[in-house]
């Protein structure tokens, strides 16, 4: 998590700040959504439990050419301890259904808000 300084501020970012910034970015995406997000692209849904940040990145990183989520992809990479590339799915990632990116972002946002309220920043 201390690697998050690269895009948000000059030094290491406290976990609470990093999570708040991710939440703010997802709020921006959902509020500024006029046309269907990423043209209706579909991604694998994830279990919002252990390994959630890497799983979310593994799903979203496959979407290319969608500028609206590029910042989210970068931010999620700061939460994931290992490098994630397109087409890579960990054993934590059960591929049982695909959903639209817009729904994925909404689900992730709701869960992150809950974590923030509960003080779970890692």
């Amino acid at each position: 998590l201390t690697c998050l300084g690269g895009f948000a501020s000059p030094g290491p970012v406290p976990p609470s700040t990093a999570l708040r910034e991710l939440i703010e970015e997802l709020v921006n995406i959902t509020q500024n959504q006029k046309a269907p997000l990423c043209n209706g692209s579909m991604v694998w849904s994830i279990n919002l439990t252990a390994g959630m940040y890497c799983a979310a990145l593994e799903s979203l990183i496959n979407v290319s050419g969608c500028s609206a989520i590029e910042k989210t992809q970068r931010m999620l990479s700061g939460f994931c301890p290992h490098k994630v590339s397109a087409g890579q799915f960990s054993s934590l990632h059960v591929r049982d259904t695909k959903i639209e990116v817009a729904q994925f972002v909404k689900d992730l946002l709701l869960h992150l808000k809950k974590l923030f309220r509960e003080g779970q920043f890692n």
């Epitope: 269907p36 043209n39 209706g40 692209s41 579909m42 991604v43 496959n62 979407v63 290319s64 087409g87």
Partner: nanobody, 116 residues
């Protein structure tokens, strides 16, 4: 330019079968995961099935598991969806999609109507 052309839809009775095809061009078909997505009248998009680039990995929505089979022929740049035991709730426009791309890269769809 990516082009996907679906065919094989039509009117079928409950319990019947149909085989949808999707001819792909404009990209290296064998390198990409592919999806079937459907949209029922007045409803949102619903993912149906996905297949990995080689065809060895297949995935299905619970609503079609055991009834639909996705396959591909990379030598013919064609994606298929074999639909058996069709139900009224399968009535929809079925789209072939290059995975992780928006509907700018989807086909025009083929209508499947299940009715007696």
């Amino acid at each position: 330019e990516v082009q996907l052309l679906e065919s094989g839809g039509g009117l079928v009775q409950p319990g019947g079968s149909l085989r949808l095809s999707c001819a792909a061009s404009g990209f290296t078909f064998r390198d990409y995961e592919m999806d079937w997505v459907r949209q029922a009248p007045g409803k949102g998009l619903e993912w149906v099935s996905s297949i990995g680039p080689s065809g060895s990995e297949t995935y299905y929505a619970d609503s079609v598991k055991g009834r639909f089979t996705i396959s591909r022929d990379n030598s013919k740049n064609t994606l298929y969806l074999q639909m058996n035991s069709l139900r009224a709730e399968d009535t929809a426009v079925y789209y072939c999609a290059k995975a992780y791309t928006g509907f700018g890269y989807w086909g025009q769809g083929t209508l499947v109507t299940v009715s007696s």
